[in-house]
């Protein structure tokens, strides 16, 4: 009689999964850009702001060609986990000035969480190594002042914007190799 009929396709092919991950990343990039602009309108930034606890930018656009799939996804996941932690911290400890960025900041957090899950699923489907996330860093200290919270928000949204921009380019390049 031959083999029994196989199961219907229950989930997207990893290539389709990568497509939808790119779409989600682009959407998150647009949200971040919009939120950063909103922050600049309300609290103009006086120059660049950094936060030592933020990850360093993973890769220059010029070096993208040499990327390997596992390295990109692992690094991207680690960096986005760090940004998720910083966004959660900002919502909790950012002070009353940053309440004006709600509910957008909450939406950003939810989408960041969704993107992280999508990346993990993609790594599972491809059977790529998934190293454990770095051990939890010590809790972030609350900003020393209201202005400290605003400067931290500028740094977090600016860094996240650059990371997501790099992520879209990297994921699109990787799609050609899958």
């Amino acid at each position: 009689p031959g083999p029994p009929p196989g199961p219907p396709r229950v989930s997207p092919d990893p290539r389709a999964e990568l497509d939808s991950t790119v779409l989600l990343t682009r959407s998150l990039l647009a949200d971040t850009r919009q939120l950063a602009a909103q922050l600049r309108d309300k609290f103009p930034a006086d120059g660049d702001h950094n936060l030592d606890s933020l990850p360093t930018l993973a890769m220059s656009a010029g070096a993208l060609g040499a990327l390997q799939l596992p390295g990109v996804l692992t690094r991207l996941r680690a960096d986005l986990l760090s940004y998720l932690r910083h966004v959660q911290w900002l919502r909790r400890a950012g002070g009353s000035s940053l309440k004006t960025l709600e509910p957008e900041l909450g939406t950003l957090q939810a989408r960041l969480d969704r993107l992280l899950r999508r990346l993990q699923l993609l790594m599972s489907r491809l059977a790529l190594p998934q190293p454990p996330p770095d051990p939890p860093a010590p809790p972030l200290a609350p900003p020393s002042s209201a202005w400290g919270g605003i400067r931290a928000a500028h740094a977090i949204l600016g860094g996240l914007h650059l990371t997501l921009d790099w992520a879209v380019r990297g994921l699109l390049l990787l799609k050609t190799r899958l």
């Epitope: 092919d13 290539r15 599972s124 998934q130």
Partner: antibody, heavy 114, light 111 residues
Framework: EVQLLESGGGLVQPGGSLRLSCAAS????????MHWVRQAPGKGLEWVSV????????YYADSVKGRFTISRDNSKNTLYLQMNSLRAEDTAVYYC???????WGQGTLVTVSS | QSVLTQPPSASGTPGQRVTISCTGS?????????VHWYQQLPGTAPKLLIY???ERPSGVPDRFSGSKSGTSASLAISGLRSEDEADYYC???????????FGGGTKLTVL
Amino acid sequence: EVQLLESGGGLVQPGGSLRLSCAASGFTFSSYGMHWVRQAPGKGLEWVSVISYDGSYKYYADSVKGRFTISRDNSKNTLYLQMNSLRAEDTAVYYCAAGVPDYWGQGTLVTVSS
Amino acid sequence: QSVLTQPPSASGTPGQRVTISCTGSSSNIGAGYDVHWYQQLPGTAPKLLIYSNNERPSGVPDRFSGSKSGTSASLAISGLRSEDEADYYCAAWDPSLNGPVFGGGTKLTVL
């Protein structure tokens, strides 16, 4: 529709070898990581081995490390498991599975007995 | 001894809601790795029921739902039916293996 069809199981003596195959169809085989998972009679599922979509990463459960070898041929849409130095405790139904695993074959029975 | 712990059995009457727990550790579920659930009907191969903690593959009824919190996860089945009688397994990635680990399985009986 997705199909995973295992073959190569059977009765083998302790210390013997077997090679299992899994023929895949209905999906883009070369885009999926592939697993072997086994189930001893009346017991639960035990993950055995995984190979990445392009064959560059291979990992094994401690219980089979050094005895089993996973491989794939993307041009033939086929997954393999070479099993050497078989033991009575390797007796199980061996399933090949794709992705998370999202898709599973019907399994092939391997019996190790003298 | 499975890395993920499930109750060996669960039961319910038709129409009832039952939940099956799956407890891991800080190195798998607690490290942020997603949980997947499988249903194995008697004499058949396992079938993916829930992936990424709470996502349902196409074709799986919405009576089945999943959740995750901390180092554990659970599968809920509402409006229990006789055809739900099966073994249910949870699984999560384990970075020390670079592969999934399975729970010991829960045999669900519909009374």
